[in-house]
Interface confidence: medium
């Protein structure tokens, strides 16, 4: 543990002014594991002036950082890049004349205390004013800055010309597209200072590439995957003062696939379980021994779980007998295609056959027949390729 500091398994505190520390505290290689440190408290360290880029990176579990009544003048831009758990930062009564929001933009801070620093009135600190105004909590900090006349101005009254929040405008409010297709989003940003723009695509699976100048940009998404349905895409404008974003939700339409169809199981009712994927929601039709199965209160389709574009359910049968033994075919259809699967179901032995076996249906079998082509007008089985979803038409969404 550095001189003038005390260390425990989870905490470092340096409050002894003599001899004091001149650099951010670092642990010896064989001492406490820095990853377990959750709090660093530093006070009365007049010679501590800088936090360098690599000073804090080892403390990945750090949640609370306090440096008060010290000589802190400069914080490197990427000082907290690795400290994603940081929640509370207190830099009260230091020598900070400026502080960039870039230090903190990736952090989800619940508290940033900056009282008692000799900030210079400039656009560089306008983000702090904006942050304060956004918080609108009763315990707003009393922050000041020094103007050209070395006069203390309340930050709340600070007016800097050509220094405001940027704006982002994404041209694609309705983003519905068919799987396998491509789209291009356009975004324009504006503001003074002129903002940079970037795309936030989260965990988008589909291949994407962007072309971005300062105020104009496009994002091209190709061979769109159905896994990206429901995801959000944002265009972000960022300058010294803050950021703005405009977002769209991606809806991907694709043809149905029956991903699961199994032999009947008995619980409260008999159930032929199935899982169907498709968007928009596919229409389901059952066939029994090749003929349309007219559902009733005794035999009906039930969807038990819907997971975005995936539907888990049963063909539910009340007290089926040997008369219900046979081939059951499920067809799922939407406007992008259809899929078909079949199983043979055996509920009960035929009367007079002791072992319960039906010679016509010796074992329950599972067969994947792909997609029946002609009864719905398909010439290919689209759903066994990359499914192309929906209940309408490939290029328009009809739900």
């Amino acid at each position: 543990c550095p001189t003038s500091c005390k260390c425990s398994a989870s905490r470092i505190w340096c409050s002894d002014p003599s001899p004091g520390i001149v650099a951010f505290p670092r642990l010896e290689p064989n001492s406490v594991d820095p990853e377990n440190i959750t709090e660093i408290f530093i006070a009365n360290q007049k010679r501590l002036e800088i936090i360098n880029e690599d000073d804090v990176e080892a403390y990945v579990g750090l949640r609370n950082l306090t440096i008060v009544d010290s000589g802190l003048k400069f914080v490197a831009h990427k000082a907290f890049l690795k400290n994603s758990n940081l929640q509370h930062i207190n830099f009260t009564r230091n020598k900070l004349t400026s502080l960039s929001r870039k230090h903190f933009r990736h952090l989800d801070l619940s508290e940033l205390i900056l009282v008692g620093n000799p900030f210079t009135c400039s656009c560089d600190i306008m983000w702090i004013k904006t942050l304060q105004e956004a918080k609108s909590s009763p315990d707003t900090q009393d922050l000041y800055c020094l103007n050209e006349s070395s006069k203390n101005i309340p930050l709340a009254n600070l007016q800097i010309p050509n220094c405001g929040l940027p704006s982002a405008n994404l041209a694609a409010p309705n983003l519905t597209v068919e799987e396998g297709k491509s789209i291009t989003l356009s975004c324009s940003v504006a503001g003074d200072p002129v903002p940079n723009m970037y795309w936030d695509v989260g965990n988008l699976v589909s291949k994407h590439m962007n072309e971005t100048s300062h105020t104009q940009g496009s994002l091209r998404i190709t061979n769109i995957s159905s896994d990206d349905s429901g995801k959000q895409i944002s265009c972000v404008a960022e300058n010294l003062v803050g950021e703005d974003q405009d977002s769209v939700n991606l809806t991907v339409h694709f043809a149905p696939t029956i991903t699961f169809l199994e032999s009947p199981t008995s619980d409260h009712h008999w159930c032929i379980p199935f899982t169907v994927k498709g968007n928009p929601k596919p229409a389901l039709q059952w066939f029994y021994n090749g003929a349309i199965l007219n559902e009733s209160k005794y035999i009906c389709t039930k969807i038990h779980v819907t997971n975005h574009t995936e539907y888990h359910g049963c063909l539910q049968l009340d007290n089926p007998t040997h008369m219900n033994n046979g081939d059951y075919t499920l067809i799922a259809k939407n406007e992008y295609g259809k899929d078909e699967k079949q199983i043979s179901a055996h509920f009960m032995g035929w009367p007079g056959i002791d072992d319960g076996a039906n010679p016509n249906y010796p074992d329950v079998i599972y067969e994947d027949y792909g997609t029946a082509a002609n009864d719905i007008g398909d010439t290919t089985n689209r759903s066994n390729e990359i499914p192309s979803t929906d209940v309408t038409d490939k290029t328009g969404r009809e739900h």
Partner: antibody, heavy 119, light 112 residues
Framework: QVQLVQSGAEVKKPGESLRISCKGS????????INWVRQMPGKGLEWMGR????????NYSPSFQGHVIFSADKSSNTVYLQWSSLEASDTAMYYC????????????WGQGTLVTVSS | QSVLTQPPSVSGAPGQRVTISCTGS?????????VHWYQQVAGLAPKLLIH???NRPSGVPDRFSGSKSGASASLTITGLQAEDEADYYC????????????FGTGTKVTVL
Amino acid sequence: QVQLVQSGAEVKKPGESLRISCKGSGYSFTNNWINWVRQMPGKGLEWMGRIDPDDSYTNYSPSFQGHVIFSADKSSNTVYLQWSSLEASDTAMYYCARRAQGGGGYDYWGQGTLVTVSS
Amino acid sequence: QSVLTQPPSVSGAPGQRVTISCTGSSSNIGAGFNVHWYQQVAGLAPKLLIHDNINRPSGVPDRFSGSKSGASASLTITGLQAEDEADYYCQSYDSSLSGWFAFGTGTKVTVL
């Protein structure tokens, strides 16, 4: 600007074969379905089917299944409608129409190809 | 035959309001699928007038409006003009096994 340009009018005899075309321009051709629509003289619009120019996936209306074939050549941004054996009842105006990506309806239509089948 | 039924004709004087209905079933409009409307002036290709029940493409005058309720949809022309004389067709997706897309039977609008 988006355009669908269809081939010119045809006069054929029953039993003959025919292929008419629809060429797209002004947009990414493989990104949109092309639909074929028939209009017999003095009658309404009938949906014949559609083709995805990207992979030549097709759907046919049951009324037209087996009588016509759709095909696509994405290198030339062209889709085709063909008959192997025309009948007098095939006399009609045939339209190709593009389905809008991300919205409903057929937003662009070809000018139509008039096919006359007469002995 | 079409699964979407429209009245064969409607007429009105200039400035009047006319409504065209499009009646479907539980496998198309009644299942929640969107309705599109097309205008076909004599001798020309059809033109998209309303998409997704209520949306007008750019360039379509605001006197044309669409609505949908249950298994039916309607196209309304308020302030009928001479150039509105044309055939009008509705269209929807049909989820029945034998269907894909269907146009309505068509309605001839005459401006008196």
